[in-house]
């Protein structure tokens, strides 16, 4: 992205914050650095050089130092040709355009809130759904499995579509689709449980369209630290939506006196948001923020995209690390409330539960902690990355690795603390989850750096598929299986019910450590893969003059 960003800046299409940074540097008489592109070196009035995209750039959310790519600068690069024709000083975009992009990011984030609100509204009234339809635990498991499996299968399909067709139309259709399905599911008669299962599968498909495509639009609206900030806002939606889902589920049920009404709230909001996306989200070109001066060439085949992604070591390792996070969150979310209830039984501060829901109070506390640590984690992660970027170019994967390894320690301490102090266990959960969630936005940012714009939706989709497949699709069942296996070889007592589940859950910190290792591996290849992605973008770009209208 060397000549490329100079070219786009020269053409008056750079982001406002980068334009401001360049003006400040011009006033200071800054010269292009060694990593800069030769083509941008001596152009414009008075020979004052434009700061290269590889240099430190001041953004709204702080400064970021770009990696010198070490690639030879070719004077005849199309981007350079465009730069030569451009005005000498970068022209900032109208403020309204910046506000428009901000509004677009806000609406996309709101859509993500609704995605999770819808998902967790069902979780919030799951006991009522189970009671109404006579659903057994295996049936509740089926509902969850069908949702995750359909989400997993649909994600790569939408990834493919998202890299080739109008993304905001796909997004809106996805929201309209899951809204309609969720609304309809509130009218399913008691005897048609299979229709409820089908509806969860269809909602999974609808939500997959959003989860895979929305981050790529944000990736095309912003770059660098601004992108990290906007992705952080986007991923705030997960804890916010989840928490609001539980609240909506229970409060609407109480207000209306019927749980069916809880399923009719998010669809209405979904329809409004889907419409707003159609109206207010710009139809951005892929790679718009990365290279504003050109247009990307024709798409590659899906098979070629997949091959390229599998060969991208940073992408593969960060995806495996994401799977580790998913494994831990899925297992802990399912079993920690019950584990803490059993701990209280052992400590004689609670009665053995014979009539579910067991550990309802613990579920509520754990849910509240998860929501808050989700917020805190995203803020901490984004802030730590911003600070570390001033010190190292490998900040993104390293912050994730440190977060994971730190999280593993505190997850381990949960099982130590739970034996004597429930409050101590909750403190360990709080710190452990904060560190675990600190990599949400950063992982998405890593993907944006190492994957070219025309492959990002596919990359997000494949990462989503992998993280569910290797993560939360199986982890709750695996933990339950291990716990049962341990209990079979021990005497039947409340102590062993507690210990067996604890020993099974000890798998989580090991997987999290493994995830930390994967992030460290990502750090090894991050700079070279980022440089490769930038080089590929350069090769993919056609000059605006040659674009057929």
């Amino acid at each position: 992205m060397m000549c490329l960003e100079c070219a786009s800046a020269a053409a008056g299409g750079a982001e406002e914050e980068e334009a401001d940074a360049e003006r400040r540097r011009r006033r200071r008489g800054a010269q292009p650095g060694a990593g800069g592109s030769a083509c941008c070196g001596a152009r414009g009035v008075g020979g004052a050089g434009v700061v290269s995209a590889d240099e430190e750039v001041q953004t709204l959310s702080g400064s970021v130092r770009r990696v010198p790519s070490g690639l030879p600068s070719i004077p005849s690069t199309p981007g350079c040709a465009a730069a030569a024709k451009g005005p000498s000083a970068p022209q900032p975009k109208p403020a309204s355009l910046g506000r428009g992009r901000g509004a677009a990011a806000a609406i996309l984030s709101l859509g993500n809130v609704l995605n999770y609100l819808d998902r967790y509204t069902v979780a919030g009234v799951l006991l009522d759904i189970q009671q109404h339809f006579g659903v057994k635990d295996r049936g509740a498991g089926l509902l969850q499995s069908v949702f995750i499996c359909s989400f997993m299968v649909a994600a790569p399909i939408f990834g493919y579509l998202g890299d080739r067709f109008n993304r905001k139309v796909i997004l809106s259709c996805g929201i309209f689709f899951w809204s309609a399905v969720t609304f309809s599911s509130s009218f399913i008669p008691q005897q048609y449980f299979w229709l409820l299962v089908l509806s969860r599968g269809l909602v999974g498909i609808g939500e997959a369209s959003y989860s895979t495509i929305a981050p790529t639009i944000i990736g095309d609206l912003f770059t660098k630290n601004t992108r990290t900030l906007m992705l952080s806002v986007f991923y705030f939606a997960i804890p916010l939506g989840s928490g609001l889902g539980y609240i909506t589920g229970s409060s609407v049920k109480q207000a209306a006196g019927d749980w069916h009404w809880a399923l009719r709230v998010s669809p209405v909001l979904g329809m409004i948001t889907g419409t707003l996306i159609l109206i207010l989200v710009p139809a951005t070109k892929r790679g718009h923020a990365d290279q504003l001066g050109g247009q990307l060439k024709a798409r590659t085949s899906w098979l070629r995209d997949m091959k390229a992604l599998i060969r991208n070591r940073s992408y593969v390792f960060s995806s495996l690390a994401t799977s580790a996070v998913s494994f831990a969150t899925g297992a802990l979310g399912m079993w920690i409330p019950l584990y803490l209830h059993r701990a209280q039984v052992v400590q004689k501060t609670a009665e053995t539960c014979n009539s579910p829901p067991c550990g309802a109070k613990d579920s509520l506390i754990f849910g509240a902690i998860t929501c808050f640590t989700g917020f805190l984690g995203v803020v901490t992660g984004a802030g730590a990355t911003r600070w570390c970027r001033l010190r190292t170019q490998r900040a993104d994967p390293l912050v994730c690795a440190v977060g994971m390894l730190g999280s593993a320690i505190f997850i381990c301490l949960i099982f130590v603390a739970a034996k004597t102090s429930i409050v101590g266990a909750y403190i360990c959960i709080f710190v452990g989850e904060t560190l675990l969630f600190s990599n949400w936005a950063i992982t998405a940012d890593i993907l944006m750096y190492v994957v070219i714009p025309t492959r990002r939706a596919t990359a997000v989709a494949l990462q989503s598929f992998t993280s569910h497949l290797l993560g939360d699709a199986g982890s709750p069942y695996l933990i339950g299986f291990i716990s049962d296996l341990i209990r079979q070889s021990t005497k039947d007592s409340p102590l062993w019910e507690f210990l067996s589940l604890g020993y099974a859950l000890m798998l989580c910190p090991f997987v999290v450590v493994l995830g930390g290792m994967f992030f460290l591996a990502t750090a090894l290849f991050f700079l070279s893969d980022r440089a490769k992605a930038e080089q590929q973008v350069n090769q993919l770009v056609m000059p605006p003059a040659s674009v057929k209208v």
Epitope: G134, V135, K136, G139, Q190
Partner: antibody, heavy 125, light 107 residues
Framework: EVQLVETGGGLVQPGSSLKLSCSTS????????MSWVRQAPGKGLEWVGL??????????NYAESVKGRFTISRDDSKRRVYLQMYTLRDQDTATYYC????????????????WGQGVMVTVSS | DIVLTQSPATLSVTPGESVSLSCRAS??????IHWYQQKSNESPRLLIK???QSMSGIPSRFSGSGSGTDFTLRINRVESEDFSVYYC?????????FGSGTKLEIK
Amino acid sequence: EVQLVETGGGLVQPGSSLKLSCSTSGFTFSETWMSWVRQAPGKGLEWVGLIKDKNSNYEANYAESVKGRFTISRDDSKRRVYLQMYTLRDQDTATYYCTSHEDFYYYSSYYFDYWGQGVMVTVSS
Amino acid sequence: DIVLTQSPATLSVTPGESVSLSCRASQGISTSIHWYQQKSNESPRLLIKYASQSMSGIPSRFSGSGSGTDFTLRINRVESEDFSVYYCQQSYNLPLTFGSGTKLEIK
């Protein structure tokens, strides 16, 4: 052939306890939710409570009129369901039916597809 | 709790006539209603589930309809063995509740 046979009825004094038993055959008992339904002499049917299967953690639900006084339990190995009645009142006098709910593996119904012949419980001083 | 009101309490008909038994719920319960027949000194037996689905082995003259709050059990051309008490039961919410019953008697 599905069979439900209730035993343990009889005449008891108010305030005393009684345990009814229902032995079953002809269906997969361990997977099936079971209910007790009663009928006072010359009156209509009244649901007493139900007990779910192992896959629903043996959760029990009761009618408000018996909550805290009656307990339903089951023994899957013996294919039996029990109704333990404490602090019996005159108004508990009724024929008690053991019933099964139709099962669909992932979920169960809330209607009663098979009924026992019933057992009479008389609460009187 | 959902209250089910059956009407009439008693219905006198001659064999060969067709009759309709009504069951009204205190709130909307979709199609979560079931009909039982109880002959004198016998246990009840399930006739219709979910408002309109006939159980196997039940004569085709028995049919059910309705949704929401109003439900009907129809018996086409009543036969002598049909003279019994009929109960509706809702499964929409716990506690499960029954109607007070409709007694079908010979005119």
